[in-house]
């Protein structure tokens, strides 16, 4: 008995598509072995039509695909544009066609609907609109026009030209009589329901000379599109419902049990708490299409999603809908990185952002998720030297450590910095990740003076006190600019006296600026790092003024001014307030991801994110 299982019989019609799911025991060998779909020949062989190794027969070119879902122990064969020639006996299987790990499937494709014994067949998707055309002869031009639905043995009046509308169709049906030149009336039914399916009869006149026309209305539930994304990655649902619902509220919901579809997000401002900080509903186009981006995918995000349009902002009968089945691949190429980073007021955080290693040259971005309305993510910094004006001097995006990870450092933290931030690039949109910054009680570990004023032509020494916990770390000073923080020479001045209960391992490291010039004005950071992995930083603003009295300046902690809450920026700074991640196409077209993605090489920060995936500050 073969362990492979699937549908024994599949029936469809010409022009339609089928999705055949084959189940296999999800052992590690089975998960990675070749999957195939082959057609059985009269003489017993089985000719491969498509396989998981990329082979597609010319018979299936452009109309079939095979997708493996290793966690579920299934693979799915999609075949579109069916013809009667596709009818036959097939096998879905694992390994080599002739080895017996397979299941027999019979596919029967029947003739597509057209005119069945003078019955016009209308095939329309759920929630959409159908127009049933009813011709009549001149002698019935002035007579009553009507549409009936066959319910069991009896025709039930749906609508007529005298103004009657069946209660089941109220508000979504109309009868149009064409101009005098055309001997035709039409019935338009909107927001089609599954219950609308059936046999209809349109009639002009009521006597024996009446004109009659049969119609068969078939209402289809939308075929869900299979979407397969990596754990911790991102998914984008593109929803195109048509211009007729352009001004109707839109929603994305997730089917929970049975018919319930819980709203994930809608244009009326509703958002499910589980998606806080990791979802954006992108503004819709004029044609009513919109997209929803979800980042930081979790195992529990897997399921069936519907997007639709309805004034209530949720699924109702007659909502036009689109459907997806999201599978979340736990064998993810996206490395683990902390989902929560903690910092203290006045302190700093260093956030590690993963990106696709194959796209090292891509532009990196960091944005702040805002929940207002449908959510947006205005950019704060990019790897091309742009920093949002309000973040000057306290935010830097570094390409280090590289090889699939970049670093974002934010210091001078306040409670206003708490929130959700997204790491992304202009390359692979599936690699958008989310991190939450939490501001907790505590004191910054690094101690520096507040504002410092240097005198032109003199020497300035700025101290930075490192507690003993950083004894094994590299300590540095650097000068901040839009493109990063350029390292500067510094002097180790021995143990610091700034810490109580801290032994000889504490350190005072000073920055010395000799013969200060105007160019020395700006933000300076002191910080710690281990190799290419950055830890805490502290920032000092150095102002430069004309000489008042001779001598050098040695700044102590006690004499320093408090750092200003907000700095006035010079007008020359390039400020792009409007740069926001809303439409993912702002940066790159969504790319189809090749099946053979690089496995992450496990390189990541030496921070142990632990089972909670939380990182306290940036200290290790």
């Amino acid at each position: 008995k073969s362990p492979i299982f699937g549908p024994e019989e599949v029936n469809s019609v010409e022009g339609n598509s089928v999705s055949i799911t084959c189940y296999y025991p999800p052992t590690s060998v089975n998960r990675h072995t070749r999957k195939y779909w082959c057609r059985q020949g009269a003489r017993g062989g089985c000719i491969t039509l498509i396989s998981s190794e990329g082979y597609v027969s010319s018979k299936y070119a452009g109309r079939a695909n095979l997708t493996n879902f290793p966690e579920n122990g299934t693979f799915v064969v999609n075949i579109a544009q069916l013809s009667q020639d596709d009818s036959g006996r097939y096998k879905c299987g694992l390994g080599i066609n002739s080895r017996g790990l397979s299941f027999d499937v019979s596919l029967e494709v029947s003739q597509g609907p057209g005119l069945l014994n003078d019955t016009k067949v209308y095939t329309v998707d759920l929630g959409r609109t159908v127009t049933i055309n009813c011709p009549f002869k001149t002698e019935n031009a002035q007579k009553r026009k009507s549409l009936y639905k066959q319910i069991g043995l009896y025709p039930v009046l749906v609508i007529d030209s005298s103004g009657y509308v069946n209660p089941n169709y109220t508000g979504r049906i109309r009868l149009d009589i064409q101009g005098t030149g055309q001997l035709l009336f039409s019935v338009v039914i909107n927001q089609l329901r599954l219950s609308d399916a059936g046999q209809y009869l349109c009639q002009a006149g009521d006597d024996s000379n009446s004109n009659k026309k049969n119609a068969d209305l078939q209402v289809l539930k939308p075929e869900p599109e299979l979407v397969y994304e990596d754990l911790r990655g991102s998914v984008t649902f593109h929803c195109a419902l048509g211009p007729e619902v352009a001004n109707v509220a839109k929603f994305l919901c997730r089917q929970s049990s049975g018919e319930n579809c819980d709203v994930v997000v809608n244009t009326l401002g509703k958002r499910a708490p589980a998606f806080e900080g990791r979802i954006l509903l992108n503004p819709q186009d004029k044609d009513g299409s919109f997209s929803v981006v979800i980042t930081g995918l979790r195992k529990e995000d897997a399921g069936r999603y519907l997007c639709g349009a309805h004034s209530d902002g949720q699924l109702q009968e007659g909502s036009p809908i689109q459907a997806w089945q999201l599978f979340v691949n736990e064998e993810s190429t996206i490395p683990r990185s902390p989902t929560v980073v903690k910092g203290v007021a006045g302190g700093s955080v260093a956030v590690l952002c993963p990106y696709n290693r194959k796209e090292s040259k891509s532009i990196k971005y960091w944005c702040l998720w805002e929940g207002a309305q449908n959510g947006r993510c205005p950019l704060l910094v990019d790897s091309e030297g742009w920093v949002k004006a309000q973040y000057e001097g306290r935010l830097s995006l570094l390409e280090e450590p590289g090889n699939g990870t970049f670093t974002v450092i934010l210091n001078q933290l306040t409670s206003r910095d708490a929130g959700f931030y997204w790491c992304l690039t202009n390359g692979d949109t599936l690699w958008r990740t989310t991190v939450e910054i939490k501001i907790i009680e505590g004191e910054p570990n690094l101690k520096v003076p507040g504002n410092v004023t240097a005198v032109l032509g003199e020497t300035l020494k700025v101290p930075c006190h490192f507690p003993c916990k950083f004894s094994s770390y590299e300590k540095y000073w650097c000068k901040w600019n839009n493109t990063g923080c350029q390292a500067l020479p510094s002097q180790d001045e021995g143990p610091s006296k700034a810490f109580v209960n801290c032994d000889e391992n504490s350190r005072l490291v000073s920055l010395t600026l000799n013969l200060v010039t105007r160019a020395d004005e700006g933000w300076y950071w002191c910080g710690v790092k281990q190799g290419h992995f950055y830890g805490e930083t502290a920032a000092v603003y150095v102002a430069v003024e004309e000489r008042k009295a001779a001598g050098s300046r040695d700044v102590s902690l006690a004499k320093a001014d408090a750092a200003p809450d907000e700095k006035v920026l010079d007008s020359g700074f390039r400020e792009i307030e409007n740069k926001a991640i809303q439409d993912p196409r702002l940066f790159a077209e969504e790319k189809a991801v090749a099946d053979t993605r690089d496995q992450a090489d496990g390189s990541r920060a030496s921070v142990d994110s632990g089972s909670s995936e939380e990182q306290g500050g940036s200290s290790r």
Epitope: V10, V13, Y23, L194, Q218, K221, E223, P224, E317
Partner: nanobody, 127 residues
Framework: EVQLVESGGGVVQAEDSLRLSCAAS????????MGWFRQAPGKEREFVAT??????????YYDDSVKGRFAVSGDNTKNTMNLQMKGLNLEDTGVYYC??????????????????WGQGTQVTVSS
Amino acid sequence: EVQLVESGGGVVQAEDSLRLSCAASGLSFSLSRMGWFRQAPGKEREFVATIEWSGRSTYKYYDDSVKGRFAVSGDNTKNTMNLQMKGLNLEDTGVYYCAANPNNYGDPRTPGAYQYWGQGTQVTVSS
């Protein structure tokens, strides 16, 4: 409230035929999957057959033990399903349950892939 009602059970001789029916009521949506499970005294509930609808395609699944003898059919616009059973044998005895779900994800052989269940109808095959 959703209800599934099975009918057609009874006592038959070995090698005889029987036709079971299942009707769902209380649903505003068409079902995407309806299946038959059976449970013999003292045994686990086991999969018999399932029919799935997706778009204008129909998919039929059978357990090996009933292949070639049982045929499942149905109409998802009416939310009804039938099971035509031929060549019945003593091992086919048990309570036959109808199960249904509005969508068709998960392995159709597992009870967890169905949300709605009927009360069951008894089929007894005597020698």
